[in-house]
């Protein structure tokens, strides 16, 4: 039994780090493998993560890390029974994938403006709370070419757009994701999408 693709890990910088790797053949990850992780501190104990299958030869492990700070380093040991398959290290603060924003809502009752709001996925005392910026994706269910991205580079989790920038009388969907540019995080997953029917008054044309 060998590791084909070494574990790569990302932290949600809140409570969970996720490690994924591939074995050289079909593997029952939960029965055959264990991933041990340990904070590089005196007296710290190793914690055990039981991996799950992620495709035939792929494994994924969700490491509970409820006490992590920016300077922390962890050792990672991947075991198959008594055999050490791989040894590595992981600094959560250098491999951050933010949580997806939540509660995306489209407010259509503000004259001819669409107001999209969502929630920051972190509590105010979290390091990422004041550092997230967002991308909002809006697309038409009827026309695959009608697909747009709005970059929200300010901290407020909201976006205003004129309803008239979208076609009237058809349904649209929106979703939002987050990243923290200054800490070189990856993008979060997209939030669940929300749907609305876009309608607005066409401006009266005078001839």
């Amino acid at each position: 039994m060998k590791v084909l693709q070494e574990p790569t890990c990302v932290s949600d910088y809140m409570s969970i780090s996720t490690c994924e790797w591939k074995m050289n053949g079909p593997t029952n990850c939960s029965t055959e493998l264990r991933l041990l992780y340990q904070l590089v501190f005196l007296l710290s104990e190793a914690h055990t993560c039981i991996p799950e299958n992620n495709g035939g030869a792929g494994c994924v492990c969700h490491l509970l890390m409820d006490d992590v700070v920016s300077a922390d380093n962890y050792t990672l040991d991947l075991w198959a029974g008594q055999q050490l398959l791989w040894k590595g290290s992981f600094k959560p603060s250098e491999h951050v994938k933010p949580r997806a924003p939540g509660n995306l809502t489209v407010h259509t009752n503000v004259s001819d403006t669409l107001l999209l709001t969502w929630s920051n996925p972190y509590p105010p005392d979290n390091y990422l709370y004041n550092h997230l910026t967002y991308a909002v994706n809006i697309w038409s269910e009827n026309d695959p070419a009608d697909f747009r991205i709005y970059n929200v580079t300010y901290l407020e989790p909201s976006l205003r757009i004129a309803a008239s920038t979208l076609k009237s009388g058809i349904s649209y969907r929106a979703r939002v994701r987050a990243w923290a540019q200054c800490y070189n995080t990856t993008w979060s997953e997209w939030s669940p999408s929300t749907k609305w029917h876009n309608s607005y008054r066409e401006p009266f044309e005078q001839h």
């Epitope: 910088y13 710290s44 006490d67 992590v68 300077a71 005392d125 800490y183």
Partner: antibody, heavy 121, light 107 residues
Framework: QVQLVETGGGLVRPGNSLKLSCVTS????????MHWLRQPPGKRLEWIAV??????????NYAESVKGRFAISRDDSKSSVYLEMNRLREEDTATYFC????????????WGQGTTLTVSS | DIQMTQSPSSLSASLGERVSLTCRAS??????LSWLQQKPDGTIKRLIY???TLDSGVPKRFSGSRSGSDYSLTISSLESEDFADYYC?????????FGGGTKLEIK
């Protein structure tokens, strides 16, 4: 409101031992890592030790200058953190401060007023 | 260890003046930097964390910024209570390390 109060400083001879205490209030102590820092007279601040929370088995980390001589410990039931100092040297003379750090947060938002240790023969 | 080089080591300035202090990190610290104020009586207060985020209750005349490995604290208009010692702190790697401090004195 958040308070941290250090006690236990004093005058000791080189080679002797002393234990400092930091009693806290106004926050959920068990959720925070706790640190000791010090400042020798007229010099910069220096970080010396940290202790983690229960889920990390109260693991500790130390500056090289105190490793093997100082030991940090905590008592969550008393919302207190301690610094046991052995084989003290004259260069350990400083004002000692405690501070706190939240997981996934930013350290040292509150500080104690400090307690002064003088190591001299 | 990461060295934090702070400048200037001392600064004389007048009330209402704008001043800037700088810290340079010897290695990448990814914005994990705070600015602390120490009053003459020894009390320490955090002003800025994450390089640029102002602590609650800190006057808006204080601001923090980053340019590569250089980090700055700016006081836009000095007031009498601002005359104190200032330290930068990196907390991106153990051991956490401080700059040498800047003594801000009244001119």
């Amino acid at each position: 409101q958040v308070q941290l109060v250090e006690t236990g400083g004093g005058l000791v001879r080189p080679g002797n031992s002393l234990k400092l205490s930091c009693v806290t209030s106004g926050f959920t102590f068990s959720n925070y890592r706790m640190h000791w820092l010090r400042q020798p007279p007229g010099k910069r601040l220096e970080w010396i030790a940290v202790i983690t929370v229960k889920s990390n088995n109260y693991g500790a980390n130390y500056a090289e200058s105190v490793k093997g001589r100082f030991a940090i410990s905590r008592d969550d039931s008393k919302s207190s953190v301690y610094l046991e100092m052995n084989r003290l040297r004259e260069e350990d003379t400083a004002t000692y401060f405690c501070s706190r750090e939240r997981a996934y947060g930013n350290p040292f938002d509150y500080w104690g007023q400090g307690t002064t240790l003088t190591v001299s023969s | 260890d990461i060295q934090m080089t702070q400048s200037p080591s001392s600064l004389s300035a007048s009330l209402g003046e704008r001043v800037s202090l700088t810290c340079r990190a010897s290695q990448e610290i990814s914005g994990y930097l705070s600015w602390l104020q120490q009053k003459p009586d020894g009390t320490i207060k955090r002003l800025i964390y994450a390089a640029s985020t102002l602590d609650s209750g800190v006057p808006k005349r204080f601001s923090g910024s980053r340019s590569g490995s250089d980090y700055s604290l700016t006081i836009s208009s000095l007031e009498s209570e601002d005359f104190a010692d200032y330290y930068c702190l990196q907390y991106g790697s153990y051991p956490y390390t401080f700059g040498g401090g800047t003594k801000l004195e009244i001119k």
